[in-house]
Interface confidence: medium
């Protein structure tokens, strides 16, 4: 029961956080003019990964898409590639987890193979999260820089006859959405990996040692025999002389060149 | 609303220099790009250099990098195209535009002019071989 509800609450938390990403992948606000020392103005900038916009005192707003420039900076692109990895790990996690749920039947899908989703998807999630915070955290640094940057340079008055008046750029709201989906992410895919331990069956059946007898003459079969805890389903192998009688583990063994001596 | 007016235009050999003016009123705080673009004789308009409000490297199309240089006086509202080594080629009616739009993090400013709201009336340079 705790397995179930540790699997299920992962897949809920990765799926508000995938959310979380995709909203924040697609925000304007990823950086906001700093009002610091302009707090009334008649426009009001801000920019996405995508486009930048103006929102002018009467409430109008304009946005102009990226596509319409002359370059963009590697790591803005790079940005944008991690946050659509985020996504699309994301996404491929969540349709896997869904298979995975032991709420869920599917035909008669084992144990074995529904711990196995739980994992690949805890671990896809994980890394989606870690994609997204990367991302976020990569653009919060470039922000940083120029924001220290124009600070310096509207003291100075560096480089001659360019501008001294910085307009400045601080963390827009989509930082935030993307750190906090982010982690939510990779929490959802952790739990999905512990929950990954609990839906593992604790020990498999594997084909045992049998013997056949055939007169004087025992035949011996070396098989896939694991050393198991000794408890449970492994103590139906036992040894059998009548005369070619076999356990239930040696009905689904095929006939090999070791079976008849 | 921002008004632009341009000064510097004239004639000049091939091989000499000149400095065009852009002087910015109005409410210059919409102006955060800011670009020199020209049309010769039976030509489209093209951009020749943008830059940006804030601390961004300017934009220089091919055909005029390491000859023009493009600057800003935020103080005075002024946009300064300094163009040395001209050719017979750089004849054109110069005219200075203003975007109010920004890019953060290096994006250069953009070079299509449906983008930029507002207009100087534009000054002519000829260049004689």
């Known amino acids: 029961m705790a397995v179930t509800a540790c699997q299920g609450l992962g897949f809920v938390v990765s799926l508000i956080g995938i959310a979380g990403i995709i909203a924040a992948t697609c925000m304007d606000q990823w950086s906001t003019q700093d009002l610091y020392n302009n707090p009334v103005t008649a426009v009001f900038n801000y920019q996405g990964l995508w486009r930048s916009c103006v929102r002018e005192s009467s409430g109008f707003t304009e946005c102009r898409g990226y596509f319409t420039l002359l370059g963009l900076p590697a790591m803005l692109q790079a940005v944008r590639a991690l946050m659509i990895v985020g996504i699309v790990l994301g996404a491929i996690g969540l349709l896997v987890s869904i298979f995975a749920l032991k709420c869920i039947r599917i035909g008669s899908m084992e144990d074995s193979a529904k711990a196995n989703m739980t994992l690949t998807s805890g671990i896809m999630f994980i890394v989606s999260g870690l994609c997204a915070i990367a991302g976020v955290s990569v653009f919060a640094n470039m922000l940083v820089t120029n924001f220290w940057m124009s600070t310096a340079n509207m003291y100075t008055g560096m480089g001659g006859m360019v501008q001294t008046v910085q307009t400045r750029y601080t963390f827009g709201a989509a930082l935030f959405v993307g750190w906090v989906a982010g982690g939510l992410t990779l929490i959802g895919g952790v739990m999905m990996c512990i929950a990954c331990r609990g839906l593992a069956p604790e020990e498999t059946n594997y084909k045992a040692v049998s013997y056949h007898a055939s007169g004087h003459s025992v035949a011996y079969k070396p098989g896939g025999f694991k050393a198991s805890t000794g408890f449970g389903s492994n103590t139906k192998n036992k040894k059998i002389y009548d005369g070619g009688a076999r356990t239930e583990d040696e009905v689904q063994s095929y006939p090999s060149k070791h079976d008849y001596v | 609303q921002v008004q632009l007016v341009e000064s510097g235009g004239g004639s000049v050999q091939a091989g000499g220099s000149l400095s065009l003016s852009c002087a910015a009123s109005g409410d210059t705080f919409h102006s955060k790009c800011m670009a020199w673009f020209r049309q010769g004789p039976g030509k489209e308009r093209e951009v020749v250099a943008t830059?940006?409000?804030?601390?961004?490297?300017?934009y220089y199309t091919d055909s005029v990098k390491g000859r023009f240089t493009i600057s800003r006086d935020a103080d005075k509202n002024r946009v300064y195209l300094q163009m040395d080594s001209l050719k017979p080629e750089d004849t054109a009616m110069y005219y200075c535009?203003?975007?109010?739009?920004?890019?953060?993090?290096?994006?250069?400013?953009?070079?299509?002019?449906?983008?930029?709201?507002?207009w100087g009336q534009g000054t002519r340079v000829t260049v004689s071989s």
């Open positions: 535009a203003a975007d109010r739009f920004t890019y953060p993090y290096g994006v250069i400013c953009g070079g299509i002019s449906a983008n930029y709201r507002y």
């Open positions: 830059i940006q409000s804030g601390y961004y490297r300017p």
